[in-house]
Amino acid sequence: MAPTSSSTKKTQLQLEHLLLDLQMILNGINNYKNPKLTRMLTFKFYMPKKATELKHLQCLEEELKPLEEVLNLAQSKNFHLRPRDLISNINVIVLELKGSETTFMCEYADETATIVEFLNRWITFSQSIISTLT
């Protein structure tokens, strides 16, 4: 079925929401004054070998649990991430974007990445897909 302008618009909005969530996480933790940043950087994330289509979001979905675990370290009184809620929201968006019709087996790169590299990769992915839709 060819995508309609309304479905394209919906996809774009969902990607923009995902992008904002990922940027919010990155901005919240990637601050040189963050006392826990060096320890957060000891956690390793799997990166997709290829991320050019919405189906590749399967690779992001599979890393959401480890992401939540690291975000549990990122809270402060003035920065309420509420990791469980945030990851749940991202999960809903990812599921809708990648679709559940086809089962895609994610292929990961050999090298693991830090949380900062991981977030930047998926931010770049989201921006790239959005640019093809607009």
């Epitope: 006392p35 320890r39 956690f43 809270q75 402060s76 009184k77």
Partner: antibody, heavy 121, light 111 residues
Framework: EVQLVQSGAEVKKPGESLKISCKGS????????IEWVRQMPGKGLEWMGV????????YYNEKFKGQVTISADKSISTAYLQWSSLKASDTAMYYC??????????????WGQGTTVTVSS | AIRLTQSPSSFSASTGDRVTITCKAS??????????LNWYQQKPGKAPKLLIY???NLESGVPSRFSGSGSGTDFTLTISSLQSEDFATYYC?????????FGGGTKVEIK
């Protein structure tokens, strides 16, 4: 009971290698980072470095970078601190400790009993 | 690295005394409203034991006679009524910036 049990005292000669251990029990070992702290005779505490047993990721105090290696074997819930060539100045008590960093905090809540390392010719 | 200066470095006290130990940081150890300053007790031949975390939170199982206060660069550990088992060395630690650093220690001896 949550505990960290360290290997026994060591007496070594300068130039020798050494690997001491810290075994965690009573909790999910890969869910917490392990820190290493040095205490030279009659002195205070110095933080050396940290390891994430789940990923193997490490971070060192610049003072100890290149002097020691921190590693872990998650299959046996054990973290290690090792030297390739000991010096007399490495004589000290070495502690491992569990890092807690959820929420708004960051502290060492459980400590090993310590391993005494004596380096003398 | 952040330097922590404890005072006094040692002193004598009697059981029942109210004891106050101070820890001064070379720069603020606060981040977004939280103080990353902890207190530990160490007895001879033993490992340090956590007493207070985040400046004022009492670790589970630690007697309520221990309390902590302060923010920014100035912190205090107070023992409201010194008991015989409290004679030990006390260390403050900052966990706001790497490398984590400890104060030089304050030894509390029997008068």
């Amino acid at each position: 009971e949550v505990q960290l049990v360290q290997s026994g005292a060591e007496v070594k000669k300068p130039g020798e290698s050494l690997k001491i251990s810290c075994k965690g029990s009573g909790y999910a070992f890969t869910n917490y980072l392990i820190e290493w702290v040095r205490q030279m005779p009659g002195k205070g505490l110095e933080w050396m470095g940290v390891i994430n047993p789940g990923s193997g990721g490490t971070y060192y105090n610049e003072k100890f970078k290149g002097q020691v290696t921190i590693s872990a074997d998650k299959s046996i819930s054990t973290a290690y601190l090792q030297w390739s060539s000991l010096k007399a100045s490495d004589t000290a008590m070495y502690y491992c400790a569990r890092w807690r960093g959820e929420g708004y905090y960051a502290y060492f809540d459980v400590w090993g009993q310590g391993t005494t390392v004596t380096v003398s010719s | 690295a952040i330097r922590l200066t404890q005072s006094p470095s040692s002193f004598s006290a009697s059981t029942g005394d109210r004891v106050t130990i101070t820890c001064k940081a070379s720069q603020s150890v606060d981040y977004q409203g939280d103080s990353y300053l902890n207190w530990y007790q160490q007895k001879p031949g033993k490992a340090p034991k956590l007493l207070i975390y985040s400046a004022s939170n009492l670790e589970s199982g630690v007697p309520s006679r221990f309390s902590g206060s302060g923010s920014g660069t100035d912190f205090t550990l107070t023992i409201s009524s010194l008991q015989s088992e409290d004679f030990a060395t006390y260390y403050c630690q900052q966990s706001n910036e790497d490398p984590y650093t400890f104060g030089g220690g304050t030894k509390v001896e029997i008068k």
